[in-house]
Amino acid sequence: APVPPGEDSKDVAAPHRQPLTSSERIDKQIRYILDGISALRKETCNKSNMCESSKEALAENNLNLPKMAEKDGCFQSGFNEETCLVKIITGLLEFEVYLEYLQNRFESSEEQARAVQMSTKVLIQFLQKKAKNLDAITTPDPTTNASLLTKLQAQNQWLQDMTTHLILRSFKEFLQSSLRALRQM
């Protein structure tokens, strides 16, 4: 099984090392999740030709996957730490239903898919500790998420492959933007 950050053999061998700061821990956690996404994308791309052929095919989708915009304050121009942090946490909470959808979508990387999901939950907890304005964070409605999940799973095989590909691509982009923004905080 993939080893979560902070639990590798080097950590055990070096007990006198300085403990990670909150920011370092978050940074490491995101990079760990990004590694997991890379592995999942590799399986998706090997299994179907989604990665090359369909870049534009259904790019105009209505999945409404979380995405950074100028108004979110996460880009260098107009950077706003508090607004951005709220966007990152809200976005990750919205991604959770899509990460649930990814479970059972992988054969050889089943554990990796679970690791990405669980590590994202941990990342959300880290970030919530860092946020001052928790009231501004809206949590998705569980009933709506349950309906969404059912509908996603009812699609035909080709559309499910496409959905998997788009979720992984969007989640990777969202995490990369988050990582860049968090390094400015």
């Epitope: 989708n61 209505n62 409404n64 309906s147 509908k151 559309l159 959905t163």
Partner: nanobody, 125 residues
Framework: QVQLVESGGGLVQTGGSLRLSCAAS?????????TGWFRQAPGKEREFVAA????????YYTDSVKGRFTISRDNAQNTVYLQMNSLKPEDTAVYYC?????????????????WGQGTQVTVSS
């Protein structure tokens, strides 16, 4: 139960314009809700024309109508419009309004749960 009623079809000459309306009643909107227009010419399959996401307002068109057709909405009236300009004989078809609460891909017909009866558009040369 959502009901869709189209209007605005008719006979028009090449280069002319028409505005189709689709009035929805009983709608429940999620952020994946979309309303679209499809068309079916005699002896052909029903094909996607244009669609609009209800919450975000983002729109999508099939290549053959880009720059000529515009899909828009009136939230207060629960109505979606299809403004069709520079009409061509190949636009002749029955135009159907469709809606779905969970439309993930605008062009995929079976993701729309509700359909109107259709309105005939005939473009004469």
């Amino acid at each position: 139960q959502v009901q869709l009623v189209e209007s605005g079809g008719g006979l028009v000459q090449t280069g002319g314009s028409l505005r189709l309306s689709c009035a929805a009643s009983g709608s429940t909107f999620s952020k994946h809700h979309a309303t679209g227009w499809f068309r079916q010419a005699p002896g052909k399959e029903r094909e996607f024309v244009a669609a609009l996401n209800w919450s975000g307002g983002n729109t999508y068109y099939t290549d053959s109508v880009k720059g000529r057709f515009t899909i828009s909405r009136d939230n207060a009236q629960n109505t979606v419009y299809l403004q069709m300009n520079s009409l061509k004989p190949e636009d002749t078809a029955v135009y159907y309004c469709a809606a779905g609460s969970y439309v993930f891909y605008f062009t995929v017909r079976d993701q729309y749960d509700y359909w109107g009866q259709g309105t005939q558009v005939t473009v004469s040369s």
